[in-house]
């Protein structure tokens, strides 16, 4: 059984901001803009690492930066879970872990992060630019998914930058509220944007980081704002698809949307948010999908010889939340 505060919170490797000090007056509005847009919204970060000892072995680490309790984590490769990706592992905080070859070991690192080691041999082994995706289902934030991959030129032992830009976005908007400081910041942002509207925008660029080697940064977000401030960048489209697995098949069914309790006066026919205020997306590559009561369609992976089933603890047990962090 997983209980509250069972393990320390794990901070993800932080994306850097290049040249931030040189453009302080220009960076500030963009920092404020990011904070205004993403305040209170959770994030998923993904880190893909090729092992130096086994060149074809990968470690995927994923974490959830949100205040809610996690009910399920799904790791897939070849794309997002509901969009052609193939399920590698499903982790439930209480009921155990299921994984499919070539996944070798999936485990919880903390209450909000997981790791998955992939076997590197055989036809189903991943290649360097395979995209790996992690989807966290959490209350009250909903389902959030982010993807990451190793660039083909990556050195062994180095990791891809963590990718906190979610593909599926969901938030019970307004449930955390907006602080007065943030409100002031947004007003100040408008003032600054008015002043600087004819100046070129700063170039924010994520830098590559290794989890073993903390690096000096000219400017870093505070711990409190890390869940809200991030540098978004697009998921790398992979041209290297994994070989067909006999244990897990890609999804072929139509997409669907579950019914969605919201504050609206009627039950929506399509996807909707828990609350009536949508969260704006940042950048055209981020698609806003309110996924707490609206899940992207997926067919269950088929059980096969490569399946490792961790036994389900039976009987009544205490739970620390309705979603499985119990």
């Amino acid at each position: 059984m997983r209980t509250e505060a069972q393990v320390p919170a794990l901070q993800p490797p932080e994306p850097g901001l290049e040249g931030a000090m040189g453009h302080r007056t220009l960076v500030l509005p963009w920092v404020l803009l990011t904070l205004c847009v993403t305040a209170g919204t959770p994030e998923v970060w993904v880190q893909v690492r090729m092992e130096a000892t086994e060149l074809s072995s990968f470690t995927i680490r994923c974490g959830f930066l949100g205040s809610g309790s996690i009910s399920l984590v799904t790791v897939s490769w070849g794309g997002p879970n509901g969009a052609g990706g193939t399920t590698l592992a499903v982790l439930h905080p209480e009921r155990g872990i299921r994984q499919w070859a070539p996944a070798r070991q999936a485990r919880w690192e903390t209450q909000s992060s997981i790791s998955l080691i992939l076997e590197g041999s055989g036809a189903s082994s991943p290649c360097a630019n395979t995209t790996f995706c992690c989807k966290f289902a959490s209350f009250p934030e909903g389902s959030w998914e982010a993807c990451g991959s190793l660039p083909p030129s990556s050195d062994p032992g180095l990791s891809a930058p963590p990718t906190p830009a979610p593909i599926l976005r969901a938030d019970l908007a307004g449930i955390l509220g907006v602080s007065g400081v943030l409100l002031f910041g947004c007003v100040y942002l408008l003032h600054l944007l008015r002043r600087h509207k004819h100046r070129p925008a700063p170039r924010l660029q994520p830098s590559r980081t290794s989890p073993q080697a903390p690096r000096a940064r000219a400017w870093a977000p505070s711990q409190a704002s890390q869940a809200a401030l991030h540098v978004p960048y697009a998921t790398i489209n992979t041209s290297c698809r994994p070989a067909t697995l006999d244990t897990a098949h890609p999804h072929g069914g139509p997409s669907w949307w579950a019914s969605l309790p919201t504050h609206a006066a009627h039950r929506p026919q399509g996807p909707a948010a828990w609350a009536s205020t949508p969260i704006p997306a940042r950048g055209s590559f981020v698609s806003v999908e309110n996924g707490l009561y609206a899940q992207a369609g997926e067919r269950p992976p088929h059980t096969g010889p490569g399946l490792t089933l961790f036994p389900d603890p039976r009987g009544p047990r205490a739970m620390e939340g309705p979603l499985g962090v119990r």
Epitope: H92, R95, W256, P261, P322
Partner: antibody, heavy 120, light 112 residues
Framework: QVQLVQSGAEVKKPGSSVKVSCKAS????????ISWVRQAPGQGLEWMGD???????NYAQKFQGRVTITADESTSTAYMELSSLRSEDTAVYYC??????????????WGQGTMVTVSS | DIVMTQSPLSLPVTPGEPASISCRSS???????????LDWYLQKPGQSPQLLIY???TRASGVPDRFSGSGSGTDFTLKISRVEAEDVGVYYC?????????FGGGTKVEIK
């Protein structure tokens, strides 16, 4: 939109078993929790247990050993089998599903209910 | 098991008037996330239950704003600001804080 459609009413003898089905249409099945809740005539609601098809089932202590909740992922159908029936098991049996993967509740989607009558 | 106690058992109401139902749990339903894992359901005559309020105070889809939930820890209240004829039925509170999930005994709301 997800719907849960249950099997029809049953009349059973004491000591026998009943198996009620609950078919989910319009959505993913394997990673969602489907609960079974029963309601005796004129009485309140009672949670019996649940299943997340990909992981397995979980039962209330009261029904442990007498109830079996299973699922067929290929047909997106959950089943609740109650054995050693007695007259006090006469009730409407509901299946219900929560909104989020891995989550037991709140139950935003309910089946229409299946009346099970235990009578000699 | 967490015991849920509802009061009153029966509540005769006048359309247009407010109504209030109380629910008390034997253990705190407050989670570390700050949410109270208590839900309210309405079961209209001859129908399956329907979700009204979840996590103590959030209205579900399609639920009129005359319904509101409040409370924290062990004491919770469902309020109907102006009762309408269609609100009749049995109201249940349910805790999802701990297995097994348990329901209150129900409050029957009927028009006077």
């Amino acid at each position: 939109q997800v719907q849960l459609v249950q099997s029809g009413a049953e009349v059973k003898k004491p000591g026998s078993s009943v198996k009620v089905s609950c078919k989910a249409s319009g959505g993913t099945f394997s990673t969602f929790a489907i609960s079974w809740v029963r309601q005796a005539p004129g009485q309140g609601l009672e949670w019996m247990g649940d299943i997340i098809p990909i992981f397995g089932s979980n039962y209330a202590q009261k029904f442990q050993g007498r109830v079996t909740i299973t699922a067929d992922e290929s047909t997106s159908t959950a089943y609740m089998e109650l054995s050693s029936l007695r007259s006090e098991d006469t009730a409407v049996y509901y299946c219900a599903r929560g909104p989020l993967e891995g989550k037991v509740s709140p139950f935003d989607i309910w089946g229409q209910g299946t009346m099970v009558t235990v009578s000699s | 098991d967490i015991v849920m106690t509802q009061s009153p058992l029966s509540l005769p109401v006048t359309p247009g008037e407010p109504a209030s139902i109380s629910c008390r749990s034997s253990q705190s339903l407050l989670h570390s996330t700050g949410y109270n894992y208590l839900d309210w359901y309405l079961q209209k005559p001859g129908q399956s239950p329907q979700l009204l309020i979840y996590v103590g105070s959030t209205r579900a889809s399609g639920v009129p704003d005359r319904f509101s939930g409040s409370g924290s820890g062990t004491d919770f209240t469902l309020k109907i600001s102006r009762v309408e004829a269609e609100d009749v039925g049995v109201y249940y509170c349910m805790q999802e804080r701990q297995f097994p999930i348990t329901f209150g005994g129900g409050t029957k709301v009927e028009i006077k």
